[in-house]
Structures are given as structure tokens and as C-alpha cells.
């Protein structure tokens, strides 16, 4: 007695797919696989299959139902922090070859990495023209200010909204200042935050306000404090620089904007007699901390002249190092003072029309604004590698 197995029904390829191998008929133990065209994927129901092979059974049926070749769906694109996504191909279309365009919030953010155009590729990932599958980055625009020029030298002035949007007030032990970098870092002086280096959360960081005592400000908290390894507390002010990492990104607007770091060419805007601007809530001529944010335009002082001014007692020799720059008037009267520590001495880059930080308020004579003495600032351009390393590592 013999019996022959039933041949199986001829497999009809699903739309956008093909059968392999193609045979005249399929009998017991014969098999076929389904392969989808580029941009289509094997689906059983709505579950993806890595591959599909069916085997002909003794009763003349296939052991698995035919799958579908469904167009690849990259799914809804991820939201872009400080940006948005626009659909180019069609409203909400997220399937193979669909195009989306990321863009950053105008004025205050600019796109890094790529042009923001992404295509849904056959692998199911949104991919940029450079082949990146990660999101672009909306980086805050730095150095925007309501002030357009440094102007001439004049007395300490009250700042207006948007003049110094990078200005940060640091409270925690003493009053100090800092300058916002990017949207989650603050540049300041090492001596201003030294006591909090192991207790970063003790720092009360405020921005977006002009009035020191105002209840209206943007609160930020510190995640970590990084003090330059070359700084020695109570042994001079060389390497008087620190970075504070904020535990959250701040929202950038006309009153909260980061300061730019100096470009390689920045020294050409920081020569002797070039004007820098220092701002802060430090002591004024009346001997009290300022209620309103104040600023003063002061010229860079020749380095040798400044070194000589601080060579005589009570200052130890070598107080002024190559990592410092000096600014002020020989006649005195214009200076930063206690409470301004850590704040930025900024300069206008006339090529980019952006303000950048050239110095950090560090130290000076016992009596602020003293004739023949100058304010001494940490020379930021010497620390660009250090700043970039910290920010990229953390």
C-alpha cells in the first residue's frame, strides 16, 4: 500500500515581495522563502519577522500562513530639544523615503551636526544626509546682547534688560558671579566657589534678573564644580578658573543667553587700550553691594605695566602671571570689586558681532578703583583646552 503526499498550493507572493525558489510545484518537505523589496519588511499581523520560510506538509498545506511585505515605518521622529520637526513628504508621513526637517527655535538656537533633513531609510531609522541616525543638536546662540558697542569709558552704569544676559548670580557663603556657557555650564573664578567644591548643591545660582534681591529670576542648581587643578587656594590667584555644571539645561531667551568663548583670533580684540566690559552686583563706591546689576567699560592695561604695579609690597613678587590680564584706568575710579568675583570681562568680536569672555574677575588692590592699580582677570583664552575637555568629558 502506498500513498503520495498532496502537493501544496502554489505560493502567491504578497505585494512588494517575491517567492524563492520558484518551482513548478511544491511537494512534501519543499520550502519557499519570502523576500521583500527594499523599503518593505516582513510582517505577520503587525509583528516584524527577520525572515520567513514555509515548509510543505504531508496534508498538502503550508506550515505557516503567508506574511505581508509592509512598507517600512520609521515611526514618529523624536522630539528635538529647543527645536521642532516638520513633515516634508506629507502630514505625519513616517514611512520609507519620507522626509522630515528638524529646525531650531529661531534667534536663540542654532543647529549643529547637520542640516536637519532626515529620510526614513529601509532599515527603519531616520537618517541624515551624512548618514547619522542620532538627532541634530540645537545649540544656544552665544554672545547676543542688547548692547551693540563697548563705547567710551564712563562711570559704573545700571544695566538694562538684555545687556548682560549671560550674567549669573552665585550665592552660597558669599556673593559671587559667573557667566553662562552653552545652556548648562557656568564659568566662574575658582576662589569664588572653592569652599563649595565638594558640596556643589549648596550653590544657589540665579540668572535672568537685574536686581540682586528680586524674587523674579530663573533658578539653577549645581550638579558639580570643577576647579582648575593648577589653582592653589590662599596661595595667589594663578589658574583662578572654575566651571559649574548645572543639573538642568536652562531655557535661552533675551534675558538668559550664554557668552561666547574666545576664538583663536580673539586676542586681536583684547590688545592694550581695547575696551572690555565688567558687570556685577559687587561693592560700589558707596561700599555696599549693588542692588541693580552694574557695569563698567574699562581698557586693557599693558601687561608689564600691570606686573610692575603689583611687584611692590604688600603684593608678593610674581603675583601677576601670564595667565592673567589687567584692566582699569591709571587714574583709578573704574574697577570691579568684591562681589563681582567670577563674573565675565567681555569684549565685542567685531567680525562675528558677538560678545565673548576675555577675562574672569579674579583679584586686585585692597581698595577697588585705586589709582595706579588695576583689576586683575583670569585670561580665559589660555584655558580653552581645559574648558573644552571638562565640557566634553562631563
Amino acid at each position: 500500500y502506498t500513498s503520495t503526499a498532496q502537493p501544496c498550493p502554489y505560493p502567491m507572493a504578497p505585494p512588494n515581495g517575491h517567492v524563492s525558489p520558484v518551482q513548478a510545484k511544491y511537494i512534501l518537505k519543499d520550502s519557499f522563502s519570502i523576500f521583500c523589496e527594499t523599503g518593505y519588511e516582513l510582517l505577520q499581523g503587525h509583528l516584524p519577522l527577520k525572515s520567513f520560510t514555509a515548509v510543505c506538509q504531508k496534508d498538502g498545506s503550508w506550515d505557516r500562513p503567508m506574511p505581508a511585505c509592509s512598507i517600512v515605518d520609521c515611526g514618529p521622529p523624536d522630539d528635538l530639544p529647543s527645536g521642532r520637526v516638520e513633515y516634508i513628504t506629507g502630514p505625519g508621513v513616517t514611512t520609507y523615503k519620507a522626509v522630515i526637517q528638524y529646525s531650531c527655535e529661531e534667534t536663540f538656537y542654532t543647529m549643529k551636526v547637520n542640516d536637519g533633513k532626515y529620510v526614513c531609510e529601509a532599515d527603519g531609522f531616520w537618517t541624515s544626509s551624512k548618514g547619522e541616525k542620532s538627532l541634530p543638536v540645537c545649540e544656544p546662540v552665544c554672545g547676543l546682547s542688547a548692547r551693540t558697542t563697548g563705547g567710551r569709558i564712563y562711570g559704573g552704569q545700571k544695566a538694562k534688560p538684555g545687556d548682560f544676559p549671560w550674567q549669573v548670580l552665585i550665592l552660597g557663603g558669599t556673593t559671587a558671579a559667573g557667566a553662562l556657557l552653552y545652556d548648562n555650564w557656568v564659568l566662574t573664578a575658582a576662589h569664588a566657589v572653592y569652599e563649595q567644591k565638594h558640596d556643589a548643591s549648596a550653590l544657589d545660582i540665579r540668572m535672568g534678573t537685574l536686581k540682586r534681591l528680586s524674587p523674579h529670576y530663573t533658578q539653577a542648581w549645581s550638579e558639580a564644580v570643577f576647579i582648575h587643578e593648577g589653582y592653589t587656594h590662599d596661595a595667589g590667584f594663578d589658574n583662578d578658573i572654575a566651571l559649574i555644571k548645572l543639573n538642568n539645561k536652562v531655557v535661552i531667551n533675551s534675558n538668559i543667553t550664554p557668552i561666547c568663548l574666545p576664538r583663536k583670533e580673539a586676542e586681536s580684540f583684547m590688545r592694550t587700550d581695547d575696551i572690555g566690559t565688567a558687570s556685577g552686583w559687587g561693592l560700589t563706591q558707596r561700599g555696599f553691594l549693588a542692588r541693580n546689576l552694574m557695569y563698567v567699560d574699562i581698557p586693557i592695561v599693558d601687561h608689564q605695566k600691570c606686573t610692575a604695579a603689583y611687584e611692590k609690597p604688600p603684593y608678593p613678587r610674581g603675583s601677576v602671571t601670564a595667565n592673567m590680564l589687567c584692566a582699569g584706568l591709571e587714574s583709578g575710579g573704574k574697577d570691579s570689586c568684591r562681589g563681582d568675583s567670577g563674573g565675565a570681562l567681555v569684549f565685542l568680536d567685531s567680525e562675528t558681532e558677538r560678545w565673548f569672555v576675555g577675562g574672569i574677575v579674579s583679584w586686585g588692590s585692597m581698595n577697588c578703583g585705586e589709582a595706579g592699580q588695576y583689576g586683575v582677570y583670569t585670561k580665559v583664552i589660555n584655558y580653552i583646552p581645559w574648558i573644552e575637555n571638562i565640557i566634553s568629558d562631563f
Epitope: L47, P48, G75, P76, R84, E86, G90, P91, T95
Partner: antibody, heavy 117, light 111 residues
Amino acid sequence: QVQLVQSGAEVKKPGASVKVSCKASGNTFTNYWMHWIRQAPGQGLEWMGYINPNTGYTDFNQKFKDRVTLTADKSTSTAYMELSSLRSEDTAVYYCTLQLGRNFDYWGQGTTVTVSS
Amino acid sequence: DIQMTQSPSSLSASVGDRVTITCRASQSVSSSRSTYIHWYQQKPGKAPKLLIYYSSNLESGVPSRFSGSGSGTDFTLTISSLQPEDFATYYCHQSWEIPYTFGQGTKLEIK
């Protein structure tokens, strides 16, 4: 913040046409999609079609394809929906809704169109 | 066209109740990556407001008492503890294919 302001209520006779406008303000988007959705009294929502004001590309619910015209004026950021051969069952509130991202992100206040002899 | 069927069409409940509204699509509205169902709330005389997108994602600013679930053809909107401001009409909506369609709505009333 985007705002969509629609034209005022209309009363039309059967067989006539109505043209509803929708002006977008506070909008700096280049690629967005303006949809039109209607809601008859006491009824649900019915999608009519969309236009990309940047390219003029349109797509429609086949139910309305022969009667609806969607246009846009980029210079004034205004979209228009014209419905012809009106009948009593077209009495409804007509909404424009702007889709930037995944959904109908912003809605107009609605325009009541009454079709009555 | 994809038909969206909501149930119940109306529902009476009290403040503090847990409420579930269901929506069934006439064909699958899911891909391997996402589910193209969204939920809207509409109050009388107002435009609809998005609550849940892609089946289970809570729209920014919407209270966490709202949640959505489901894939394929069956979906639910749940309000964990009804508040007075939640009495409104709720619509499910599919954006899987054109023409986009909505459920007929579920009117949630105070008991």
C-alpha cells in the same frame, strides 16, 4: 505662539458656495499642513482634506473631492476652504487645524455655516 | 476607509470614578514601530484638544490621570479618577491612512 483666526459665520442657500478663511499668525514654519475638519450639529468630527501652503499640495477625503477647493496665500499666511453645491447636510462648524508635527497642533475657533432655504 | 467605532456612545459617572472608553478600528492601524491612534477631548462650543498621541503618549500639559493603551485594532482611553473638568466628549482618531477618520464620540456626563 501660533493663532488661527477664522472668518465669521455664514448663512447660505442650497446650491450656493461658501468660502471660509483661516489666518495663521505667529507662524514661522515653512512646512506645515492645514487641515479642514467639520462637525455637524450634535455629530462627530469629519476630516475633509489638507493643503501644504508652502507647496500647494493637497489631498482630500474622496467624499468631498468634487466639491471642495483648498487654497492658500503664502504672503498673508491665510488658507481657504471653498465648498460648493451646498446642501442642508453641510450645515456644520468648520475648523481649520494646523499640523506641524505629529498631530493637529493648533485649531481655529470654528466657523458656523448654515445651509437653509 | 477605516471605520472607528467607540463605545459606549455616552457614559454617566461620578467625580473620582475610574472610566474606560474603548475604540475599535476596522483594520490594523499599527506598524512595527508605532500605533497611529490619538485621543481628543472636546467641550461644548470649543475646538477639540489633544490628550493622547500614538496610542499611549500623554500630550504636554495633560494631567497624568489620562492614559491610553492598545495596538492593532483595539484601543482604550482611561481616566483614573474623574475630575469635574473632565466631563466632555472624547474622540479617537486614526492617522494611519487617508482619509483620516474619527470615532463617533463618547459623551461623558455627570451621574
